[in-house]
Interface confidence: medium
């Protein structure tokens, strides 16, 4: 059956400088490719995170991501600033051999409204 | 005081269509995600059909995808729910709920309409 | 699709005694979990959301408790008011959400 990636919460309210977590879970590591975690859509969404070993400053995964059969590809977002304002979206990927990897499922989406402290 | 007010329901022929109208108040009706849930006589809640507050997001229960259109009008604080080609499993209670801002679960009903489907 | 299946289907008890009612997801659905109270002719209200979390107004006496597959509704001390269906509700999962089929407390 096909994977499923699932973004429980609509949205999340955060005050600036505070942190906040974005849940998301899979139901199958397969096929084989990375999550990333993106903010809005279509030619102007930035990648956010992802479970690539890569450094992202101010953000972090939440659980144990190198554990075998991990689901959970929720992130921590620290220090939050109005600039992070957005919908945020858990995207699954098929790795490719030679070509780019290929999206094959992303999750509901969680609007992050900031706050004024 | 949130508000959820249901009307249009009524008993109609098989195959036939009604449509029903929830009018709200009590909150900024635009902002939130309603849904539209069923309950036949005697038997438990179904779930029918969500829609966003925007409009742009609408999902619906397999038994009535293709049959049901749901939408809604912001400016006049209202949801709508057009029922086609009606069966007889179609009959029950209707109830427009409020969905919670961040989760899917229903902090506020209508006390819900009546559809009896029969010939 | 996530099932909620409810038991037992109808429990009955007298004023004053304990209820536990039981909810089992079909898989995790996490603590997204919610309970509704339905009394005849009525719609229903919203008692519990994040399995434990009570509803604003709802008595003290009512509690919820679970994670994952398994969840229970307790009310501690059943008063007159309570006899009434409830039931589970799963917001885990992207639609269709879905509702358990109920258990009815009635007076013994």
């Known amino acids: 059956t096909e994977v499923k990636v699932t973004q429980p919460e609509k949205s999340v309210s955060v005050a600036a400088g505070d942190s906040t977590i974005l849940n998301c879970t899979v139901t199958s590591l397969l096929p084989v490719g990375p999550i990333r975690w993106y903010r809005g859509v279509g030619q102007s969404r930035l990648l956010i995170y992802s479970f690539t070993g890569e450094h992202f400053p101010r953000i972090r995964n939440v659980s144990d991501t190198t554990k075998r059969n991990n689901m959970d590809f929720s992130i921590r977002i620290s220090n939050v600033t109005p600039e992070d304002a957005g919908t945020y979206y858990c995207v699954k990927f098929q790795r490719g051999s030679s070509e780019p990897d290929t999206e094959i499922q992303s999750g509901g989406g969680t609007e992050v409204y900031v706050l004024a402290k | 005081e949130v508000q959820l007010v249901e009307s249009g329901g009524g008993v109609v022929q098989p195959g036939r269509s009604l449509r029903l109208s929830c009018a709200a108040s009590g909150f900024t009706f635009s902002s939130y995600d309603v849904n539209w849930v069923r309950q036949a006589p005697g038997k438990g809640l179904e779930w029918v059909s969500l829609?966003?507050?925007?409009?742009?997001?609408?999902y619906y229960a397999d038994s009535v995808k293709g049959r049901f259109t749901i939408s809604r009008d912001n400016s006049k604080n209202t949801l709508y729910l057009q029922m086609n080609s009606l069966r007889a499993e179609d009959t029950a209670v209707y109830y427009c709920?409020?969905?919670?801002?961040?989760?899917?679960?229903?902090?506020?009903w209508g006390q819900g309409t009546l559809v009896t489907v029969s010939s | 699709e996530i099932v909620l299946t409810q038991s037992p289907g109808t429990l009955s008890l007298s004023p004053g005694e304990r209820a536990t009612l039981s909810c089992r997801a079909s898989q995790s659905v996490y603590t997204y979990l919610a309970w509704y109270q339905q009394k005849p002719g009525q719609a229903p209200r919203l008692l519990i959301y994040g399995a434990s979390s009570r509803a604003t107004g709802i008595p003290d006496r009512f509690s919820g408790s679970g994670s994952g597959t398994e969840f229970t509704l307790t009310i501690s001390s059943l008063q007159s008011e309570d006899f009434a269906v409830y039931y589970c509700q799963q917001y885990y999962d992207r639609p269709p959400l879905t509702f358990g089929g109920g258990t009815k407390v009635e007076i013994k």
């Open positions: 829609i966003s507050g925007s409009g742009e997001i609408i």
């Open positions: 709920a409020k969905e919670n801002n961040r989760y899917r679960f229903f902090d506020d």
